[in-house]
């Protein structure tokens, strides 16, 4: 049967075996304090998973600057707000005399946490779009990109836990948090659902004194206590990579290839998102089909369904088709694709402001999922990005120039030297439920949602209303 024909650089059989068809995401944030280094990296995942890792590395310098100690997870990030808890300033060796330092952590009531969640979700949307535009500006034109705003926000928010003075204010601003957003940490913790596992861990050198208040706050809010590294770089490397592998379901087996001998602080945040399509795609219907890329047409593996449940509409502001596909665990994939080939993705990106995005998501909430003729490429996007340049693009320079982490450590000589963020997002066919062939009747007018040109995507948490992942696809083969 010619239906099986699949002409492309990969035959249909091999394409069908490329993954379970899950959407899984793992984000690792790594922050090392050695020489001014802050690395945030999300490592690639295996088939049908999404991983993001963020690593921040810091080291001691002669400058009295401290470095952020959290690592951005690869999930939607929030805009500057203050940590839910404040760290005490009881240490006798405050880096800066008379300066503000986070006070003791105060836990929030359920009522406070609940009201904070809406603010946090809103902030995460704003932060996600800030990040999207920053990532886009740093990337080559017409290239794929993926990141986890939530991962990055988680890392920066954990840094916020120990930030003082300007660093605190600047972080709040970047994250779009209101000033003194004291419940943010607990709210952030509440944003984890069954489909998303978020874990944090701090590793530090034996000679670095971490404040008890920060240790306690981390334990309470991020469910981890700082672990002491040894004086053996190789052993430390193994310890960190083992932790990462364990906490990303082995999707990221090696976050670090090397560890500087003068590493003093490593902050990791791993987010593993494992979600499947609510409705399975039939792998037999995945074929090599045309996709408009730049000024040509390429062949890519396309998933097809005649009656896939999609909520969709045309947005006139963006001149885009907007479609939402259900995933498990109250998550969904939202796709924004230019209405036709006359409209470019770049133009759509530029028009995508927080207010436009929020209006689209509100409209999607009101839209019904209807059986739709759907054509969607298999997606695998891998992105590695230096986050220091992203932070500077967002006009946050503290990691390089004037970092104040007085609430984290008494040591005034920390500076972020590297921050790397890496994400792999892969979407294949498998879902939780089989397509209900007889359960849905096709409307008299056939509803169509075909995605055969570059598009923007958002992995959306429908309960808390924030982006877990965001990105764009220019070339689904990449």
């Amino acid at each position: 049967n010619p239906n099986a024909t699949s002409s492309s650089s990969q035959d249909p059989e091999s394409l069908q075996d490329r993954g379970e068809g899950k959407v899984a995401t793992t984000v690792i944030s790594k922050m090392l304090f050695v020489e001014p280094i802050l690395e945030v990296s999300s490592l690639p995942t295996t088939n049908s998973t999404t991983n993001s890792a963020t690593k921040i590395t810091a080291n001691t310098t002669d400058e009295p600057t401290t470095q952020p100690t959290t690592e951005p997870t690869t999930q939607p990030t929030i805009q500057p707000t203050q940590p839910t808890t404040q760290l005490p300033t009881d240490s006798p060796t405050q880096p800066t005399t008379g300066s503000f330092c986070p006070g003791p952590v105060t836990l929030c009531s359920d009522l406070e946490s609940h009201s904070t969640e809406a603010v946090l979700g809103d902030a995460l949307v704003d932060f996600s779009l800030k990040l999207y535009h920053a990532f886009s500006a740093m990337k080559k034109v017409e290239t794929n990109m993926a990141f986890s705003p939530f991962s990055i926000a988680s890392l920066l928010t954990q840094v916020l836990l120990g930030a003082g003075e300007n660093t605190k204010t600047n972080l709040e601003s970047i994250l779009s948090y209101p000033k003194d957003f004291t419940c943010v940490h607990q709210a952030l913790k509440g944003f984890t659902t069954k489909g998303v596992t978020s874990v944090s861990q701090i590793f530090h050198s034996p000679d670095l004194a971490i404040r008890d208040t920060f240790v306690n706050a981390s334990r309470t809010l991020y469910s981890s206590s700082p672990r002491v590294l040894s004086n053996n770089s190789d052993a430390n490397l193994e310890l960190i990579n083992t932790w990462v592998a364990k906490n990303t379901n082995n999707k990221i087996s090696r976050l670090l290839d090397s560890l500087p001998s003068d590493t003093r602080l490593v902050l990791l945040n791993a987010i593993y998102l494992s979600a499947k399509w609510k409705t399975t795609f039939d792998p037999k219907k995945t074929r090599m089909e045309p996709f408009h890329f730049k000024n040509s047409v390429i062949k890519v593996p396309m998933m097809n369904s005649k009656k896939y449940p999609v909520a969709h509409f045309i947005d006139q502001t963006l001149k885009a088709k907007v479609g939402q596909l259900q995933l498990s665990h109250n998550l969904s994939l939202v796709i924004l694709v230019p209405q036709n080939l006359k409209h470019r993705l770049e133009d759509m990106e530029q028009a995508l402001s927080p207010s436009v995005f929020k209006a689209i998501m509100e409209k999607l909430e009101m839209s019904k999922f209807q059986p739709t003729l759907l054509t969607l490429p298999r997606i695998k996007v891998t992105t590695s990005q230096d986050m220091l340049s992203i932070m500077e693009k967002l006009e946050f320079f503290d990691f390089s120039y004037d970092l104040n982490l007085c609430g984290l450590t008494e040591d005034p000589d920390l500076q972020v030297s590297a921050m790397q963020h890496q994400t792999v997002l892969e979407l294949t066919e498998t879902g939780v439920e089989a397509a209900a062939a007889s359960a849905i009747s096709v409307a008299r007018t056939l509803l169509v949602f075909e995605v055969q040109q570059p598009f923007l995507f958002v992995l959306w948490d429908q309960q808390h209303k924030f982006p877990v992942f965001m990105g764009r696809v220019y070339d689904p083969r990449a």
């Epitope: 010619p2 024909t5 492309s8 062949k299 036709n340 169509v448």
Partner: antibody, heavy 119, light 111 residues
């Protein structure tokens, strides 16, 4: 029986227009890409244009871009080719073809309709 | 000139085995794209003979077989019959041209 039936061909002057139609029957039309393929007298086959299942995406050979427009009406099981600014080199038998994959294997063909561009 | 190169003609006697070649490049067959073969009997529309390099649609006799290697493909017809006299076209996707392309065709004569 699976069938494709073209119509609309004829004699037209250079610069003129024609609209070809292709009526499909015997299968679920919206399950397939559709294409137009032409064959000049005594010559080989040339793919001209294709359209996605839902009709949202269209594809053309360079020589007809901007002059020809492919479209489909899934409710009527019909494929169209609007041909404008016709040239002598467009003279050919135009076949409508069903395409189960994505513009590569044409498993069912119509009988063809002749388009002659001449003054 | 066609992107896919076929010999203009081929011939054989009844019962013989005949092979028709189709040579492409790294932007089509060499890019691991599938090759299709079509048969066009005199005065009729083309018919799909082989798809996906070597698969036969139902109704096509197993005397027809296809294969592909590198940037070339070939169609083999064994037990040649008079009714096999026709034009044969290979086809594939071409990245450079962003679309499907056909070979120039091979006229098979059964002597």
């Amino acid at each position: 029986e699976v069938q494709l039936l073209e119509s609309g061909g004829g004699l037209v002057q250079p610069g003129g227009s024609l609209r070809l139609s292709c009526a499909a029957s015997g299968f679920t039309f919206s399950d397939y890409y559709m294409s137009w393929i032409r064959q000049a007298p005594g010559k080989g086959l040339e793919w001209v244009s294709g359209i996605s299942r839902g009709g949202e995406y269209t594809f053309y050979v360079d020589s007809v871009k901007g002059r020809f427009t492919i479209s489909r009406d899934n409710s009527k099981n019909t494929l169209y080719l609007q041909m404008n600014s016709l040239r002598a080199e467009d003279t050919a038998v135009y076949y409508c073809a069903r395409d189960p994959g994505g513009l590569d294997a044409f498993d069912i063909w119509g009988q063809g309709t002749l388009v002659t561009v001449s003054s | 000139q066609s992107v896919l190169t076929q010999p203009p003609s081929a011939s054989g006697t009844p019962g013989q085995r005949v092979t028709i070649s189709c040579t492409g490049s790294s932007s089509n067959i060499g890019a691991r794209y599938d090759v299709q073969w079509y048969q066009q009997l005199p005065g009729t529309a083309p018919k799909l003979l082989i798809y996906g390099n070597s698969n036969r649609p139902s109704g096509v006799p197993d005397r027809f077989s296809g294969s592909k290697s590198g940037t070339s493909a070939s169609l083999a017809i064994s037990g040649l019959r008079s009714e096999d006299e026709a034009d044969y076209y290979c086809a594939s996707w071409d990245d450079s041209l962003s679309g499907p392309v056909f070979g120039g065709g091979t006229k098979l004569t059964v002597l």
